[in-house]
Amino acid sequence: VPLSRTVRCTCISISNQPVNPRSLEKLEIIPASQFCPRVEIIATMKKKGEKRCLNPESKAIKNLLKAVSKERSKRSP
């Protein structure tokens, strides 16, 4: 569950559940910074614009990131 904050981390809870790349509107990867010491991944779904914080350590999420980057590299000339 993400919370908007100017300081500190955004994600309050994280999900290990795999997400279908085709149902993704947007995938934000927020690198660790002075505000939050960990990487955060926030998925925005096409349906209702629902958001979900994903666990960067989860195997399913790592596979999702690979699939998304592969999809992007296909699209870019």
């Epitope: 569950v1 904050r5 809870s13 994280i14 939050c36 979900r52 914080c53």
Partner: antibody, heavy 121, light 109 residues
Framework: QVQLVESGGGVVQPGRSLRLSCAAS????????MHWVRQAPGKGLEWVAL????????YYADSVKGRFTISRDNSKNTLYLQMNSLRAEDTAVYYC??????????????WGQGTTVTVSS | EIVLTQSPGTLSLSPGERATLSCRAS???????LAWYQQKPGQAPRLLIY???SRATGIPDRFSGSGSGTDFTLTISRLEPEDFAVYYC??????????FGPGTKVDIK
């Protein structure tokens, strides 16, 4: 099954301290934000505090800020509420509740049975 | 701080009737952030609705939620004997506190 069990409640004098515990089982505790919510006798629900899944984020209701501290031990699957400088108005049933992670906000989907704190001289 | 107001305070109805509970926010709440809970005497609350309109796991379809902005509604299409309880709305805005409404008691007429 998914379960939260609170303990540590009791009768305490004003100004004294108490520590509540909440033991979690049946789910990946280290993925979930956790809340404390209280309910004074015959009254409604009052959100008390929230801690992020890894303990980095902590948030408090104004009524307890500076007196209560929420913490967690993911290796023990346990949530805590340290309550200092207790007042009569802190008398309530204290519930721990899970912040469901599979969505933007799915509410508090699992609750403990509650532990009673009575502050009285 | 967002303040939630629930009306009516008490709703006296008979089994089989339709119940309409209102929750009004002092400022706009994203519908993603509005939940409804049911609480019976001596029990912990139970999540019914999240995201203003999505039913939680295992919640019967006679419960439905709607609304946006500052006005939200919980509807119980046909009251069953086990539905007589207190109902709370809660907002989970972009910053704490995550306030609850004062509750609506649904009791048997």
């Amino acid at each position: 099954q998914v379960q939260l069990v609170e303990s540590g409640g009791g009768v305490v004098q004003p100004g004294r301290s108490l520590r509540l515990s909440c033991a979690a089982s049946g789910f990946t505790f280290s993925n979930c934000g956790m809340h404390w919510v209280r309910q004074a006798p015959g009254k409604g629900l009052e959100w008390v505090a929230l801690i992020g899944f890894d303990g980095i984020n902590e948030y408090y209701a104004d009524s307890v800020k500076g007196r209560f501290t929420i913490s967690r031990d993911n290796s023990k699957n346990t949530l805590y509420l340290q309550m200092n400088s207790l007042r009569a108005e802190d008398t309530a049933v204290y519930y721990c509740a899970r912040d469901w992670p599979e969505g933007y906000y799915n509410g508090m989907d699992v609750w403990g049975q509650g532990t009673t704190v009575t502050v009285s001289s | 701080e967002i303040v939630l107001t629930q009306s009516p305070g008490t709703l006296s109805l008979s089994p089989g009737e339709r119940a309409t509970l209102s929750c009004r926010a002092s400022q706009s709440v994203s519908s993603s952030y509005l939940a409804w809970y049911q609480q019976k005497p001596g029990q912990a609350p139970r999540l019914l609705i999240y995201g203003a309109s999505s039913r939680a796991t295992g919640i019967p379809d006679r419960f439905s939620g709607s609304g946006s902005g500052t006005d939200f509604t919980l509807t119980i299409s046909r009251l069953e004997p086990e539905d007589f309880a207190v109902y709370y709305c809660q907002q989970y805005g972009s910053s704490p506190p995550f306030t609850f409404g004062p509750g609506t008691k649904v009791d048997i007429k």
